[in-house]
């Protein structure tokens, strides 16, 4: 069944003399391998032979015979599936049919194939999207329906006869569907390609000229202008007249329509390629240029900048920055419209002409308070001087300056005052508006600027104060001088170092810890009784009877102090003994009789002795010797010694008589 | 050509006083703010007194304020320095001196004039 | 009130470069001028605004002044730059005008 057999390849191939030519062929039989193989030229089928005539190019049989042709055509393909042939070279008289007559066991088919060859190389074509504008990217074609391996080719992009700098890219296909080799170039065509020729050109491998094909581009785009002004250097003074011309170099498709903008903005009722400005005004200064519109937009021509000239006009000046701290940098621009620019300036401050600077800037790296004012000027051109405008207003700021303190109080303040005191300055800006004090204290402010110390310290020594703006000035702190009466008056013993001792030298010493003013009296009294003026007490010799309780005065203009009481204490051996009796130095025997050592002593006495008539020392060591009951033989003397830290002291003699009691007479 | 000549100078006894002047040329006068600086003998530069082009603004060094009067005549080109209740340590060159508004510097000086107390 | 301190004087030899200086606190923030004067002659303006030089000034002339230091540099000293050299401020706080007390620049 010979619908079984299936075929594919390029319907037509196409080469010319000497080339070569690739067939692409692919095939199926379905009822096994192939077993034998012809390739004819023109083939035509003899009925009365039931065989095909025509020229034999290649025969591939079971015996293996091949004609002399073999080696000019190739049969590149198998036994079921590839049918691809090769000629190489191709010859003008190859062009026709190509009949591939195939055989298997049981099947046999005829593929035809047409091959057209041409004389001399064939041009490619060149294909063109149907429209191209300027500066939009296109991409050219140039196709050529043939590709063989055998036969390497190019083509190459040319732009009124010389080779285009873009890239193209080359492609080829040598497949059952398609054989052709192709070039891609990218291009972004300007206004000035319109009417170009382009062409792609067919070349070997050694770049001989092969064949072309040619095309003429049609770039379409807006008016390309040209622009013509009298003067030729569009500069003019107000009052001169001015004429632009507007030239169309080129236009596809034709222009419509003409206007004139100025500054970007169409100028009204000016439709003709001719614009005539008569006595011109600075105003008409600008970038003029003409538009021209056609299909595809407006063109514009190139900008024509008309500078009509005039003397300055009133300046204006603008201070970068107001309000200035003092010591900060400022600058002052002098801006005043005019044509040519301004040559030189004349500062002026306060109204009055600031000499050494005629620049357009002034810069001042550190302001200084006198530049604080207004500031004006004048610009001047070739053509005149201008007019002084408003002037700006520069504001320095600083901190308070020469901030003092000040007492309102009379002097001298004492102790106990209310104080008063203000904060001054010289001069300050902005306004001042807080004060600070040191130290801090719960202290009045009645004002701004006035602190009120009520009971004023003895100690509030120095204060200072600040006034404030955006910055605080401190001023030096005052002294205040409180005037106060002497401060911890003590009585202290200078010598001995050691206690005190009866006949001992000693020194006692008034002490205060300050006094303002300085100068001071000394006081020394002993109950109530004034004893001296120094501010020492010296004893050359102490005795008991100056112990007690002492105070020191001390005083000043201010008023006086007294110290705590302080208690003189002198040590002495035990002094003025004495032994007395009791119930008295007469006694009943069978009583009870006490004896008293009765004693003066500092400290007072640690240890008793007790002695009778015949100083023998009792066996009691008490202050109190009791005799209970007392006998007749207790008569006699009696004496005591005491001891203490300081020394031993002894009584004199106390005579202590017992009597009879009447019982004991009555027995005798 | 910028040009500052004082006068005015001389011998005065402590307590008495003196007026310094100081003729100003070459330049707008009425424009500058001007100075006086004086320089005891064999010492330093101490500045004295400052006054601006329209004399509203006068500034005095604490040595001499409340005795010594800056003052200035536009009209006459003249600049003065009236001193009362001179001292010993008065004495030196009193220098007429130029201010460049802009900077505070001193641009120009005169020769100076000796006052000797 | 404020004060200027500058060495009282500086020796160079000839062709080198002489460095006076003058303290201050916070100077770097007030506008420096420095003055030359020669013996028996007036002051005259050699450096202002920190560092700006009057015309008539040579170029070996400079200044420059930051944190605490202002700086008066002489370069390839030459005898005729022998002279008093004195630096002064603007103090704003006293309104006042402040001079340096003086260097003296002795050329070897």
């Known amino acids: 069944d010979s619908s079984k057999w299936v075929f594919e390849h390029p319907e037509t191939l196409y080469a010319w003399e000497g080339a070569c030519v690739w067939i692409p062929c692919t095939y199926r039989a379905l009822d096994g391998d192939l077993e034998s193989f012809i390739l004819f030229h023109n083939p035509e089928y003899n009925k009365n032979t039931s065989k095909f005539d025509g020229t034999r190019l290649y025969e591939s049989t079971k015996d293996g015979k091949v004609p002399s042709e073999q080696k000019r055509v190739q049969f590149l393909g198998d036994k079921n599936k590839n049918c691809t042939l090769s000629i190489h070279p191709v010859h003008l008289n190859d062009s026709g049919q190509l009949g591939l007559r195939m055989e298997s066991k049981t099947e046999k088919w005829m593929e035809r194939i047409h091959l057209n060859v041409s004389e001399r190389p064939f041009p490619p074509h060149i294909q063109l999207p149907p429209e191209i504008q300027e500066s939009q990217e296109v991409t050219l074609t140039c196709l050529l329906n043939f590709s063989c391996y055998g036969y390497p080719i190019q083509l190459q992009w040319l732009l009124e006869g010389v080779p285009m700098r873009q890239a193209a890219v080359t492609s080829t296909s040598l497949t059952i569907k398609s054989v052709f080799t192709r070039s891609e170039l990218k291009f972004s065509p300007q206004w000035s390609h319109h009417g170009k020729i382009v062409t792609c050109q067919l070349q070997d491998a050694d770049g001989k000229f092969l064949s072309n094909d040619t095309v003429q581009l049609n770039v379409k785009h807006t008016p390309k202008l040209e622009i013509k002004v009298t003067p030729s250097d569009a500069i003019v003074r107000e009052g001169d007249s001015v004429t632009m011309t507007c030239e169309v170099s080129s236009s596809n498709p034709e222009y419509t329509t003409v206007s004139w903008l100025k500054d970007g903005t169409s100028l009204k009722k000016q439709n003709t390629f001719t614009l005539n400005l008569r006595e011109v005004t600075k105003d008409q200064s600008g970038k003029y240029c003409c538009q021209v519109s056609n299909d595809v937009g407006p063109g514009r021509s190139e900008e024509v900048f008309l500078q009509v000239q005039y003397a300055p006009e009133p300046s204006t000046v603008q201070i970068l920055h107001s309000p200035a701290v003092e010591g900060s940098q400022v600058e002052f621009l002098c801006m005043s419209l005019a044509n040519p620019l301004p040559t030189n300036y004349t500062w002026y401050h306060n109204g009055k002409e600031m000499q050494g600077r005629t620049e357009e800037k002034v810069h001042i790296p550190k302001i200084l308070p006198w530049h604080a004012g207004t500031y004006s000027c004048v610009a001047e051109n070739i053509l005149g001087t201008g007019q002084r405008g408003p002037g700006a207003e520069l504001d320095v700021q600083y901190p308070p300056k020469k901030v003092t303190t000040v007492i309102q109080n009379p002097m001298p303040i004492r102790e106990g005052d209310t104080v008063t005191l203000s904060c001054n300055y010289n001069s300050s800006n902005p306004s001042v508006t807080r004060y600070e004090w040191k130290p801090h204290g719960a202290w009045e402010e009645p004002s701004l600027g006035v602190l009120k110390i009520q009971n004023v310290g003895w100690d509030n020594t120095t204060i200072a104060c600040a006034a404030c703006n955006s910055w605080c000035s401190w001023a030096s702190p005052v002294a205040l001088n409180v005037q106060y009466a002497p401060r911890d008056v003590r009585v202290r013993k200078i010598k001995p170092l050691s206690e005190i001792h009866s006949g001992n030298s000693v020194s006692l010493q008034c002490d205060f810890s300050s006094s303002h003013p300085k100068e001071v009296q000394f006081f020394w009294e002993k109950n109530g009784r004034l004893l001296g003026k120094e501010s020492q007490l010296n004893f050359d010799s102490i005795s008991p009877e100056d112990a007690g309780s002492y105070s020191c005065w001390v005083n000043n203009s201010i008023g006086q102090t007294a110290s705590k009481a302080w208690t003189l204490e002198v040590l002495y051996a035990p002094r003025r003994l004495r032994v007395s009796m009791s119930p008295g130095d007469q006694v009943m025997e069978g009583k009870s009789a006490t004896l008293t050592c009765e004693s003066d002593a500092n400290p007072p006495v640690s240890h008793y002795t007790w002695f009778d008539w015949n100083n023998q020392s009792l066996p009691y060591h008490s202050q109190k010797l009791r005799l209970e009951p007392v006998k007749v033989q207790h008569s006699g003397a009696y004496w005591c010694q005491g001891t203490n830290s300081v020394g031993k002291g002894r009584s004199p003699l106390s005579t202590l008589t017992v009597y009879y009691s009447p019982e004991t007479i009555g027995r005798r | 050509e910028v040009q500052l000549v004082e006068s005015g100078g001389g011998l005065v006894k402590p307590g008495g006083s003196l007026r310094l002047s100081c003729a100003a040329s070459g330049f707008t006068f009425s424009d500058y703010y001007m100075s006086w600086i004086r320089q005891a003998p064999g010492k330093g530069l101490e500045w004295v007194s400052y006054i601006s082009s329209s004399g509203s603004t006068i500034y005095y060094a604490d040595s001499v304020k409340g005795r010594f009067t800056i003052s200035r005549d536009n009209a006459k080109n003249s600049l003065y320095l009236q001193m009362n209740s001179l001292r010993a340590e008065d004495t030196a060159v009193y220098y007429c001196?130029?201010?460049?508004?802009?900077?505070?510097?001193?641009?120009?000086w005169g020769q100076g004039t000796l006052v000797t107390v | 009130s404020y004060v200027l301190t500058q060495p009282p004087s500086v020796s160079v030899a000839p062709g080198k470069t002489a460095t006076i200086t003058c303290g201050g606190t916070?100077?770097?923030?007030?506008?420096v001028h420095w003055y030359q004067q020669k013996p028996g002659q007036a002051p005259v303006l050699a450096i202002y605004y920190d560092s700006d030089r009057p015309s008539g000034i040579p170029e070996r002339f400079s200044g420059s002044n930051s944190g605490n230091t202002a700086t008066l540099t002489i370069s390839r000293v030459e005898a005729g730059d022998e002279a008093d050299y004195f630096c002064?401020?603007?103090?704003?706080?006293?309104?006042?005008?402040?001079f340096g007390g003086g260097t003296k620049l002795t050329v070897l």
């Open positions: 002064q401020v603007w103090d704003s706080s006293s309104d006042h005008w402040v």
């Open positions: 916070n100077i770097g923030s007030k506008n």
């Open positions: 001196a130029r201010d460049d508004f802009w900077s505070g510097s001193v641009d120009y």
